[in-house]
């Protein structure tokens, strides 16, 4: 056979679907690897072929499209399961070819079991909503294309295991779920169960979104350095251990990159000859405000080390801050860094 452009196993698309539910999986070739769409390819005389490798097997085999009730079928560039079974888990390959051209890609498909409370190994998308803001809507995800617009499915929303009925600030509105003035207590997993008829059968789609209530942009500030500060003096004798924490508060800012670093006499710790250890820890508030602590330590401090200028720096998308630590040698009245 002719050479085939093999894109390998596309692990970026770790597709997970629930057992005993319909699943429609588009061939990734047209979404991520090729410049043209399925219609163009088809009209050019190219054929799309599907095959798979079962879990824990090496043998590629064709997909059986002759199962009862057309349980597995192909429509254009979509592979359909109506519904999935647990043993459909495996690596699926779609190949586009004619006599002179061939391109293929494989992707993993995992069929996941869930319990009656929707607990499973499924990875859920996270929707962040700002605390106390007016109205936030989440939409039942990934249900497009399962039924025609003429079909009006029934939709039931749950928080955890509890159907959302008379929740004070959470209102189900068909495919949408509205949150009014959200609070941290609204955090959790929200599941929509969409039920629709097809060819005399009822199918269910289960989709879960993790809601995380985060700090409001109205509260967003530049970094606030709690430590070091002007009230604490690090007074040490040569030979003692010097430990200075740099503790910085970052209010939550969507997609902000929060940074903390030390400079010693204006240089990064890696660029000085001092034997410095820096350990970092991070903690988060209920609204994902971040407190980042970088502890600078020198095991056996020298008189020279006690004359250096230790400055904690912090940066986020709102601005920068810096604060020098007051370091002095015991018995030495000077709190300012000495210049020889």
């Amino acid at each position: 056979s002719e050479r085939c452009d093999d894109w390998g196993l596309d692990t970026m698309r770790q597709i997970q679907v629930f057992e005993d539910e319909p699943a429609r999986i588009k061939c990734p070739l047209f979404e991520h690897f090729l410049k043209y769409n399925y219609s163009t390819a088809h009209s050019s005389g190219l054929t799309l072929i599907w095959y798979w490798t079962r879990q824990d097997r090496d043998l590629e085999e064709p997909i059986n499209f002759r199962l009862p009730e057309n349980r597995i079928s192909k429509e254009k560039d979509v592979l359909w399961f109506r519904p999935t079974l647990l043993n459909d888990t495996g690596n699926y390959t779609c190949m586009l070819r004619n006599t002179t051209y061939c391109s293929k890609v494989a992707f993993p498909l995992e069929v996941v079991q869930k319990d009656s409370c929707f607990n499973s190994a499924m990875r859920f998308p996270v929707h962040k909503m700002y605390i106390e803001h007016g109205i936030h809507k989440i939409t039942c995800p990934n249900v497009d294309g399962y039924f025609p617009s003429s079909v009006k499915p029934s939709v039931t929303w749950y928080k955890g295991c509890t159907e959302i009925v008379d929740f004070h600030n959470v209102l189900p509105e068909g495919m949408n779920l509205s949150f009014f003035i959200p609070l941290v207590s609204n955090n959790g997993n929200y599941t929509c169960v969409v039920t629709y008829p097809e060819n005399g059968r009822l199918f269910h789609l289960t989709r879960t979104v993790t809601v995380k209530v985060v700090g409001s942009p109205k509260d967003a500030l530049p970094p606030q350095i709690y430590s070091p500060n002007d009230r604490v003096v690090y007074e040490k004798e040569p030979g003692e251990e010097l430990v200075i924490p740099c503790k910085v508060y970052f209010s939550f800012i969507m997609d902000s990159h929060n940074e903390v670093w030390w400079t010693i006499d204006g240089k990064k710790p890696d660029d000085v000859t001092v034997d410095i250890t820096i350990n970092e820890s991070v903690s988060y508030s209920s609204t994902e405000d971040e407190t980042r602590t970088q502890i600078l330590s020198i095991k056996k401090v020298t008189p020279e080390d006690l004359r250096r200028n230790y400055v904690c720096h912090a940066r986020n998308t709102k601005g920068e801050a810096e604060q020098a630590a007051k370091v002095k040698q015991k018995g030495n009245g000077c709190t300012e860094p000495m210049t020889l």
Epitope: E132, H133, G134, I135, F180, I181, L183, V184, S185
Partner: antibody, heavy 118, light 107 residues
Framework: EVQLLESGGGLVQPGGSLRLSCAAS????????LGWVRQAPGKGLEWVSA????????LYADSVKGRFTISRDNSKNTLYLQMNSLRAEDTAVYYC???????????WGQGTLVTVSS | EIVMTQSPATLSVSPGERATLSCRAS??????LAWYQQKPGQAPRLLIY???TRATGIPARFSGSGSGTEFTLTISSLQSEDFAVYYC?????????FGQGTKVEIK
């Protein structure tokens, strides 16, 4: 200094309407969600309604849902409570209050008395 | 909705003595609990938020503790101006709800 000043209270017959106002000063009004809390004579405090900083999100106690409407005008630094289909049990002092999730109702107005009686 | 229950309904204390007020929530409210003081003819005043943080300008003799469902407001040494009604309030879940109040009166 944060100040909240309610007005619009008075005597009204059952089934009647009243509109309360709360004029705010001393803080950046559009940055804060606000609420109404009432207190019937000799009784405890009852949360009535809340509104988000932008006015889009509103919430109501079950006892007033469908009858009361909370709104705000950020250009005038004013909070409103439109009260329709008033009942005798709505008789109370109505307080407007500023709130944050972090600090609850941190500032209150002095209150305005609403009396529903025939 | 979350029901807040305060005890006792009335507390008789002598000036200079310690007063301990209790508040119980029907389900966990984490640390999202506030305490208010109200004197006759006045609006409520915020004393404590976050179960234990004193509001601006509140004297150190007022302290709050607890989390989850059990909360306490302690007034270490009652002053004459502290005789009032005290309310707890949860702001963890909508609707925000208040306790029925504890009246602290002079013994």
């Amino acid at each position: 200094e944060v100040q909240l000043l309610e007005s619009g209270g008075g005597l009204v017959q059952p089934g009647g309407s009243l509109r309360l106002s709360c004029a705010a000063s001393g803080f950046t009004f559009p940055d804060y969600p606000l609420g109404w809390v009432r207190q019937a004579p000799g009784k405890g405090l009852e949360w009535v309604s809340a509104i988000s900083y932008d006015g889009e999100g509103t919430l109501y106690a079950d006892s007033v849902k469908g009858r009361f409407t909370i709104s705000r005008d950020n250009s005038k630094n004013t909070l409103y409570l439109q009260m329709n289909s008033l009942r005798a049990e709505d008789t109370a002092v109505y307080y407007c209050a500023r709130f944050r999730y972090y600090t609850a109702f941190d500032y209150w107005g002095q209150g305005t008395l609403v009396t529903v009686s025939s | 909705e979350i029901v807040m229950t305060q005890s006792p309904a009335t507390l008789s204390v002598s000036p200079g003595e310690r007063a301990t007020l209790s508040c119980r929530a029907s389900q966990s409210v984490s640390s999202n609990l506030a305490w208010y003081q109200q004197k006759p003819g006045q609006a409520p005043r915020l004393l404590i938020y976050g179960a234990s943080t004193r509001a601006t300008g509140i004297p150190a003799r007022f302290s709050g503790s607890g989390s989850g469902t059990e909360f306490t407001l302690t007034i270490s040494s009652l002053q004459s101006e502290d005789f009032a009604v005290y309310y707890c309030q949860q702001y963890n879940n909508w609707p925000w709800t208040f306790g029925q109040g504890t009246k602290v009166e002079i013994k």
